[in-house]
């Protein structure tokens, strides 16, 4: 079998064997090495020599295999836009941001750029659980049978109705989607004359 070409090598069809780690350089019509994450091109390749890479300076990064001549500047998460940091910037990864608690992403351009307050869910409903927190605004769904939620809130969850008998009480009024069961002390036992079967 033929030995694998090592960059730089000529490419007549403008494609390279390893698309992730190599790129086509049109001036010289050759395939050259990309620089690994955390680095940038310090010297371009030529027909005779390969790309030279250098490490990104502090507070800058490149996330992917690249042929960039600069590193990207690290940017902080903007609290004015409702964002908070979950992981700091490194030479290989930009600052990781998310929406602050109680907020959702309202503007998305490859990443979240602006968060807004989550809408309240009215009594009798709760926010549908999402795979990713802060991804979208609340979608309110009714409490399921046997549960209630009695506030207007972006985050309150439906709770199960109280079972009066578990507390040695009896139900005075049944629970609804918006209110809990009302319990009271059990009634005094009936007088003897009222006991037994009543015949008409």
């Amino acid at each position: 079998s033929q030995p694998q070409a090592v960059p730089p090598y000529a490419s007549e069809n403008q494609t390279c064997r390893d698309q992730e780690k190599e790129y086509y350089e049109p001036q010289h019509r050759i395939c050259c090495s990309r620089c690994p994450p955390g680095t940038y091109v310090s010297a371009k390749c030529s027909r005779i020599r390969d790309t030279v890479c250098a490490t990104c300076a502090e507070n800058s990064y490149n996330e992917h295999w690249n042929y960039l001549t600069i590193c990207q500047l690290c940017r902080p998460c903007d609290p004015v836009m409702g964002l908070e940091e979950i992981a700091p910037c490194t030479s290989k990864r930009k600052t990781q941001c998310r929406c602050q608690p109680g907020m959702f992403c309202a503007a998305w351009a490859l990443e979240c750029t602006h968060c807004e307050l989550l809408s309240d869910c009215p009594p009798g409903t709760e926010a549908e659980l999402k795979d990713e927190v802060g991804k979208g605004n609340n979608h309110c769904v009714p409490c399921k049978a046997g549960h209630f939620q009695n506030t207007s809130s972006p985050s309150a969850r439906c709770q199960p109705h109280t079972r009066c008998e578990n507390q040695g009480l009896v139900e005075a009024a049944p629970g609804t989607a918006q209110s809990d069961t009302t319990c009271k002390n059990p009634l005094e036992p009936l007088p003897p004359e009222m006991s037994g079967t009543m015949l008409m």
């Epitope: 010289h28 310090s42 010297a43 371009k44 030529s46 005779i48 030279v52 250098a54």
Partner: antibody, heavy 120, light 107 residues
Framework: QVQLQESGPGRVKPSQTLSLTCTVS??????????WSWIRQHPGKVLEWIGY???????YYNPSLKSRVTISVDTSKNQLSLKLNSVNAADTAVYYC????????????WGQGALVTVSS | DLQLTQSPSSLSASVGDRVTITCRAS??????LNWYQQKPGKAPKLLIY???SLQSGVPSRFSGSGSGTDFTLTISSLQPEDFETYYC?????????FGQGTRLEIK
């Protein structure tokens, strides 16, 4: 305007090591993606590429000299150096340092040259 | 290694003449050919790169052409300071190699 100036002993004994330095002025040796090269010209006027180096430490050598040559860059002194081991009479030449533009393989700035004679 | 052969080895001409120097490569090198001028006791000076591109500061009477294996350096109207030695150099493959030189003399 970039200027290059070679310096070193004009005479080296056979089997010893030839050492030359090239001082770069008018520009930083670690800027612009440049490579820095050594080329020699034998008494018969034939030019021979020795090799070149980048400030990062990346080097490329002529295979005919690779086993004997070391080229390095000292960014703190803005200098390029050449070491050629086990010299003989055939290494007698004028040694030039030169700059190689980013992404190219020609020489746009040259030093004035340093004659090195190998003899006992 | 890739060989470059210059012709002629020496050339006699007069001021005002148009002269052509040839460089032939032992294999195709696209347009990866460069030309230098060297004065006695001085370093070579880059005139033309990539076969036909004029280096900054070089007079326009110098021009280069060619592709593949055959290249020419032309001086359209010789000046007294042009009577020097000229070298071609290939930058197509390692190792970099030079032609043996063409010496231009006053007739």
């Amino acid at each position: 305007q970039v200027q290059l100036q070679e310096s070193g002993p004009g005479r080296v004994k056979p089997s010893q090591t030839l050492s030359l330095t090239c001082t770069v002025s008018g520009g930083s040796i670690n800027s612009g993606g440049y490579f820095w090269s050594w080329i020699r010209q034998h008494p018969g006027k034939v030019l021979e590429w020795i090799g070149y180096s980048h400030y990062s430490g990346t080097t490329y050598y002529n295979p005919s000299l690779k086993s004997r040559v070391t080229i390095s860059v000292d960014t703190s002194k803005n200098q390029l150096s050449l070491k050629l081991n086990s010299v003989n009479a055939a290494d007698t030449a004028v040694y030039y340092c030169a700059r190689v533009p980013d992404g190219e393989d020609y020489f746009d700035y040259w030093g004035q040259g340093a004659l090195v004679t190998v003899s006992s | 290694d890739l060989q470059l052969t210059q012709s002629p080895s020496s050339l006699s001409a007069s001021v005002g003449d148009r002269v052509t120097i040839t460089c032939r490569a032992s294999q195709t090198i696209s347009s990866y050919l460069n030309w230098y001028q060297q004065k006695p006791g001085k370093a070579p000076k880059l005139l033309i790169y990539d076969a036909s591109s004029l280096q900054s500061g070089v007079p326009s009477r110098f021009s280069g052409s060619g592709s593949g294996t055959d290249f020419t350096l032309t001086i359209s109207s010789l000046q007294p300071e042009d009577f020097e030695t000229y070298y071609c150099q290939q930058s197509f493959s390692a190792p970099i190699t030079f032609g043996q030189g063409t010496r231009l003399e006053i007739k």
